[in-house]
Interface confidence: low
């Protein structure tokens, strides 16, 4: 069977948040399979997803060897009845892909706050990257360290000007007004960046002076 | 204050083991990592490992895998390194250093550090 | 394993000169570099990351630049609390994360 029947992938994507990291490429195959195959700048090639009908590769597991590399995927595809030859198989490259640099941030929980007097306390949950070493979950920081920030942006309930304050802890304390109301929200930053450097904004949180002044929020946060 | 405080000098007999502990105090434990450092007399700084508390995840120098482990007691605040089949090369002081990555030792370079075990081996 | 290469091994200086140290790795490091103070008998200090930031609470007049193979530490204005012996230490790759052979600061 030549190479004429298949199609060479393209439109290669990296979708990556928090360091899990996935291939994604058109076009869906007919008759016809893709192999992924990553590597580091001036390493050697390793086989993902091999032989596969999907238009997606998960390759978490390779970029975090070391997620300060730059690595480059390619899609080859193959006939579905294809009998392994010397001939190289069209391929596409993705796109370079340096982790620490590109990985998207997630969406930041506030995970408690308190507000005593005029003083309120507010902290971050300490993001999971979903990647495991050995059998432990990566919090964002334990990879960013000190290059990870976050910006909380507060307002009085009763009014819309937003003020900032920045940490980079997972813990906000800021001074208010007594007896009033605040809403905020936070948002991971890494200032050294020059891309990607802002996650979503968190969900909107309000204090109740009225109501109990220390909460968790709805996200139970499991400490280790 | 943040600090990291290392147990007292030892003296040891070439092919005996050596366990060095560095307590640390003032600041989180297993939100950074812990690196291992060593200087021989009149010599340079030689990186021996890391680990994080957190994971227990580590890193050792290749030339010496083998014959060094470096653990974590999250309870006690206090990292351990131990080195076997102790050679007379080995007589340094010996540093643990706080190190901001808990991944892998990043770039941020090691920013508190004990004050040294001074590990002498001689028969 | 990454080479780092420390020059010059001894440096002769005077109190106000302005120094400059040079590390070279011996493949790209992109910009994972730390410098480290040390003093004898002391434990190293670090003085700057990530190749040009500064750590807290050391004074303005020590500087990082570089990028790729070739960095410099700068002492704008030699002070006599730097005379001391002066680390380069990467971290671009996995273990060993290679310190430089060291620069001498002394009194000329």
């Known amino acids: 069977t030549g190479t004429t029947d298949v199609i060479v992938a393209y439109n290669l994507t990296w979708k990556s948040t928090n360091f899990k990291t996935i291939l994604e490429w058109e076009p869906k195959p007919i008759n016809y399979v893709y192999t992924v195959q990553i590597s580091p700048r001036l390493g050697d090639w390793k086989n993902k997803c091999f032989h596969t009908t999907d238009t997606e590769c998960d390759v978490t597991d390779e970029i975090m060897r070391n997620v300060k590399e730059t690595y480059v995927a390619r899609v080859l595809s193959y006939p579905a009845d294809t009998v392994l030859t010397a001939q190289e198989p069209p391929f596409t490259n993705s796109p370079p892909f340096t982790p620490y640099l590109d990985t998207n941030l997630g969406q930041p929980v506030i995970q408690s706050f308190e507000q005593v007097g005029t003083k309120l306390n507010v902290t971050v949950e300490a993001a999971r990257t979903l990647v495991r070493v050995n059998g432990t979950f990566l919090r964002l920081r334990d990879v960013f360290g000190k290059d990870l920030n976050y910006t909380l942006y507060y307002w009085r309930a009763s009014s819309t000007g937003k003020k900032k304050a920045t940490t980079n802890t997972n813990e906000f304390l800021i001074d208010v007004d007594k007896g009033e109301n605040y809403c905020f929200s936070v948002q991971a930053v890494i200032p050294s960046r020059r891309v990607n450097q802002k996650s979503p904004e968190s969900r909107i949180e309000c204090t109740s002076q009225e109501k109990a002044v220390s909460r968790e929020t709805g996200h139970h946060h499991h400490h280790h | 204050q943040v600090q990291l405080v290392q147990s007292g000098a030892e003296v040891k007999k070439p092919g005996a083991s050596v366990k060095v502990s560095c307590k640390a105090s003032g600041y989180t434990f297993d939100a950074y990592g812990i690196s291992w450092v060593r200087q021989a007399p009149g010599q340079g700084l030689e990186w021996m490992g890391w680990i994080a508390p957190y994971s227990g995840n580590t890193n050792y120098a290749q030339k010496l895998q083998g014959r060094v482990t470096m653990t974590t007691d999250t309870s006690t605040s206090t990292a351990y390194m131990e080195l076997r089949s102790l050679r007379s090369d080995d007589t340094a002081v010996y540093y643990c250093?706080?190190?901001?990555?808990?991944?892998?030792?990043f770039g941020y370079g090691m920013d508190v550090w004990g004050q040294g075990t001074t590990v002498t081996v001689s028969s | 394993d990454i080479q780092m290469t420390q020059s010059p091994s001894t440096l002769s200086a005077s109190v106000g000169d302005r120094v400059t140290i040079t590390c070279r790795a011996s493949e790209s490091i992109s910009n994972w570099l730390a410098w480290y103070q040390q003093k004898p008998g002391k434990a190293p200090k670090l003085l700057i990351y990530k190749a040009y930031s500064l750590e807290y609470g050391v004074p303005s007049r020590f500087s990082g630049s570089g990028s790729g193979t070739e960095f410099t530490l700068t002492i704008s204005s030699l002070q006599p609390d730097d005379f001391a012996t002066y680390y380069c230490q990467q971290f671009q790759k996995l273990p060993p994360f290679t310190f430089g052979g060291g620069t001498k600061v002394e009194i000329k």
């Open positions: 250093a706080r190190d901001a990555g808990t991944y892998s030792p």
